[in-house]
């Protein structure tokens, strides 16, 4: 049984602290004790668990990095989203740090991309 | 009676390998998290490993990253810590103990690990 | 990592007096997830308290857990004989799980 398959209706309300394992499986925002009896809640802005699961201990949150902000915070379900600043963004090849954008375009090419938090500006060659 | 007997501990050389066994009695094995946990010569006490009753979770002390992988077998009630490219540094007792986070409540006698040229 | 450190490295005492052991987490550790344990030469360790301060079975009411946050005590009331030992305290708050370089309580 794959955890998504588990029915919904089965996982805990989000105000439960312990629950049942299903299947000996816990549901996203709870892990399980290490005597399999109770699915223990995760504890909010601290630690998450996204998926149905037999974890002895959710998983961290991940802080933002200097020169990343916060988009979306940690909940006992979801991870932290981080995102470049302004002015910054992450290449696919070294996602750990944030790179600052080019200013603008070597001659002989015009901008058609402004940065973003995912990708530098790009440029094309001017049409003759 | 609760009862873990871990067997497998010996003379190795720097690199090589071995298997740690431990066998479980006198509780539902396949329900509860269990680790290993060892002791160097004249040493504290250093937690290794870690693995869920259903044994779909495992966690690792970071010094052993890698090379050691825990794992279970619950139809014969036993655990094992396979131990690969092993250091001077790993030789110690290694204990199998019941329980992972809110403590370990028993434990084996220990079996010794040597690691030399 | 959760570093846990104790003291006194060596306690001194005479059977009978009162033995205070600490143990002081580098961050905060969920009271459920802290233990201590007691080691005697040649043999393994055994757990006295679990969720800082719930005795474990058959464990003597001599032996007493406290605390919370990054403080933590284990009390032995009056020192008997047997008593003489390392205590070690553990963390399973966060991984990785991590023990205190433990304190021998020896005889004056």
């Known amino acids: 049984i794959t955890r998504q398959s588990l029915d919904p209706q089965r996982r805990a309300a989000p105000q439960q602290k312990r629950s049942s394992p299903t299947e000996g499986l816990c549901p996203p925002g709870h892990h399980i004790s290490e005597d399999s009896r109770e699915c223990i809640s995760c504890k909010y802005g601290q630690d998450y668990s996204t998926h149905w699961n037999d974890f002895l201990f959710c998983l961290r949150c991940t802080k933002c990095d200097s020169g990343e902000v916060e988009v979306n915070s940690c909940t006992t379900t979801r991870n932290t989203v981080c995102q470049c600043e302004e002015g910054t963004f992450r290449e696919e090849d070294s996602p750990e740090i944030c790179r600052k954008c080019r200013t603008g375009c070597p001659r002989g090419m015009v901008k058609v991309k402004d940065c973003t938090p995912w990708s530098d500006i790009e440029c094309v060659h001017k049409e003759s | 009676e609760v009862q873990l007997l871990e067997s497998g501990g010996g003379l190795v050389q720097p690199g090589g390998s071995l298997r740690l066994s431990c066998a479980a009695s006198g509780f539902t094995f396949s329900s509860y998290a269990m680790s290993w946990v060892r002791q160097a010569p004249g040493k504290g006490l250093e937690w290794v490993s870690a693995?869920?009753?259903?044994?779909?979770?495992?966690y690792y002390a970071d010094s052993v990253k890698g090379r050691f992988t825990i794992s279970r077998d619950n139809s014969k009630n036993t655990l094992y810590l396979q131990m690969n490219s092993l250091r001077a540094e790993d030789m110690a007792v290694y204990y199998c103990a019941k329980g992972a986070r809110v403590s370990f409540d028993y434990w084996g006698q220990g079996t010794l690990v040597t690691v030399s040229s | 990592e959760i570093v846990l450190t104790q003291s006194p490295g060596t306690l001194s005492l005479s059977p009978g007096e009162r033995a205070t052991l600490s143990c002081r987490a580098s961050q905060s550790v969920s009271s459920s997830y802290l233990a201590w344990y007691q080691q005697k030469p040649g043999q393994a360790p055994r757990l006295l308290i679990y969720g800082a301060s719930s005795r474990a079975t058959g464990i003597p009411d001599r032996f007493s857990g406290s605390g919370s946050g990054t403080d933590f005590t284990l009390t032995i009331s009056r020192l008997e004989p047997e008593d003489f030992a390392v205590y070690y305290c553990?963390?399973?708050?966060?991984?990785?799980?991590?023990f205190g370089q433990g304190t021998k309580v020896e005889i004056k």
């Open positions: 693995i869920s009753g259903s044994g779909g979770s495992t």
């Open positions: 553990q963390q399973g708050s966060q991984p990785p799980i991590t």
